[in-house]
Amino acid sequence: MGALKGQEFAPSHQQVYAPLRADGDKPRAHLTVVRQTPTQHFKNQFPALHWEHELGLAFTKNRMNYTNKFLLIPESGDYFIYSQVTFRGMTSESSEIRQAGRPNKPDSITVVITKVTDSYPEPTQLLMGTKSVSEVGSNWFQPIYLGAMFSLQEGDKLMVNVSDISLVDYTKEDKTFFGAFLL
Amino acid sequence: MGALKGQEFAPSHQQVYAPLRADGDKPRAHLTVVRQTPTQHFKNQFPALHWEHELGLAFTKNRMNYTNKFLLIPESGDYFIYSQVTFRGMTSESSEIRQAGRPNKPDSITVVITKVTDSYPEPTQLLMGTKSVSEVGSNWFQPIYLGAMFSLQEGDKLMVNVSDISLVDYTKEDKTFFGAFLL
Amino acid sequence: MGALKGQEFAPSHQQVYAPLRADGDKPRAHLTVVRQTPTQHFKNQFPALHWEHELGLAFTKNRMNYTNKFLLIPESGDYFIYSQVTFRGMTSESSEIRQAGRPNKPDSITVVITKVTDSYPEPTQLLMGTKSVSEVGSNWFQPIYLGAMFSLQEGDKLMVNVSDISLVDYTKEDKTFFGAFLL
């Protein structure tokens, strides 16, 4: 290369003024389903799921932390956020996921990925997948998948809400999951 | 810029200690559906799809290779992996995809993205999309989409398995596909 | 570091020959649904949706522009492209989304993400999600999600086409959306 003199130092990436950063160093998380403990929630408010964050296929890295149903965004930027929730219903009375007289054949199933910002009282719905249920068989199951890119701020919190927590299939980590990564 | 002397060399990306790399240089693949040749498989084992890797919209690049139904991971890191499989069923006896007396109206349809590690015979299921089928019409069709991020090791292999290969819509490259890219 | 002499200049990223670039500087867009104005379209040609590109969750950045139903690709490279369209149908005659005697209970619903290249007259279908509709209830709704990676050229244009514009749920920005980002 020879000695670098005067204006001769012109590496191919000189056009970049924002700090570069190694990709492996970006905040990332993939969370997987766990058995849900039924919690009290308001009638028109969808309950939030809680997640596994370190066993099996689940992980959080590079300051992306999971705590109390929330993914915490450690750095401002554009994130790709995704989730799949597999729902299942059984008309059999003895079904483990049938609870407290709640019908196991709902009119609809819904997943919402929600952003909470501490400085703003009202959560923001980022993504919604909603489907009417017209299964005619006694046992039914189906996934709802969501994914998109959003500009998030350091300190934002993400959660996944569902229309009926008792219908979520928690039996396998590959069926119901939630993740985000900085682009 | 002038000559670089002493401690004056401090580009804006000095905080990065891991090697930086150009994004266009990362392993990537998008594979598209081809007509499947029916293969023998065990009763409780879902068959793997094979794929187009270089014609039309399909490609592999930067050491990501496709061989014998598998995507080969050339470099350890976090990958986003996705697939869509469109299923279709027809009750008409003359249907091209009706095979060997197998009913074309299944109870369910399932897609699994599976990781295989050479040092271990048992595959790991990364993603599963499974849906009960209760279509009442004679002809039905629907997609299952999956996508998420996983930490993979150099040498890992990825495949897509389905519950019934005869129900996969192989007619168009935009309907059924499989891809992965290093983040 | 000392003065840089001779061959001593060997930073850890010297293996990168393509220009490096800051991630925050890449073309990106997330577009959200707006109420569609019914337009004339040919019988066998699916109409394109138009989108919100700057209000609410919608944004375009780094030379990715939206104009007249199209996302304009400002730079060649590999892009992840995604869309969700939520469809809904109501059998009630007074339904706002029931139009011009068109039946509101279609046989199928379809979303296509299409690439248009000015130098080539025929659009390329990149992604298709298509589903037969066999809902038995009077009101039905469901999303179709698509996402994959494609190699695009500067000047390419992307749009989202649907089988029936009158069935698209435009009521909420989190239900129906379209986005792309350079990897």
Epitope: L55, F59 | T117, S119 | -
Partner: antibody, heavy 124, light 107 residues
Amino acid sequence: EVQLVESGGGLVQPGGSLRLSCAASGYDFTYYGISWVRQAPGKGLEWVAWISTYNGNTHYARMLQGRFTISRDNAKNSLYLQMNSLRAEDTAVYYCARENYYGSGAYRGGMDVWGQGTTVTVSS
Amino acid sequence: EIVLTQSPATLSLSPGERATLSCRASQSVSSYLAWYQQKPGQAPRLLIYDASNRATGIPARFSGSGSGTDFTLTISSLEPEDFAVYYCQQRSNWPWTFGQGTKVEIK
């Protein structure tokens, strides 16, 4: 055959250091977490540390945090326990054990595969 | 940290008898409790995971029950090879912790 084989034990003086290794074979190393568990002579089992071979997350027994470091090398299917500032009370048989999560949100699993153990003696 | 207390410390029984071992947690561990068997000079062996699920290859005479803070391992009819030390382990909260063990010896 699924196997864990520990090595690296031995006699070390108080204040000294030792690095234990655990070589795994016969399974997908990156999927299952691994714990180190120790057993002092004539005593019960004591959990020492855990690592996710998948993502590198770690947890330690409170009394040992700061002196012991668990790590892994996925390319070598190997796990390590670096033990510093050793004390007489660290004398034990050290086992590595695979943590089976069973891939289900319904379960937390258990340690389903154990090595034969390696003996660490801290004495002057 | 969660403390697990096993009782009794020693259980003296004859082959063919029923053994009932108890494990009590200082706070709820849901169903996230495992049981292990250890024989002299050997590594422990997983018997039961998640309170009631038998591990691969474990005979049906071993069963587990309980949730929250109180758990039981039952050996319906003791075989000669079952005389050993049994440990419970909670897997609900870090750090994982073991009980002090129950020794099942031949009467």
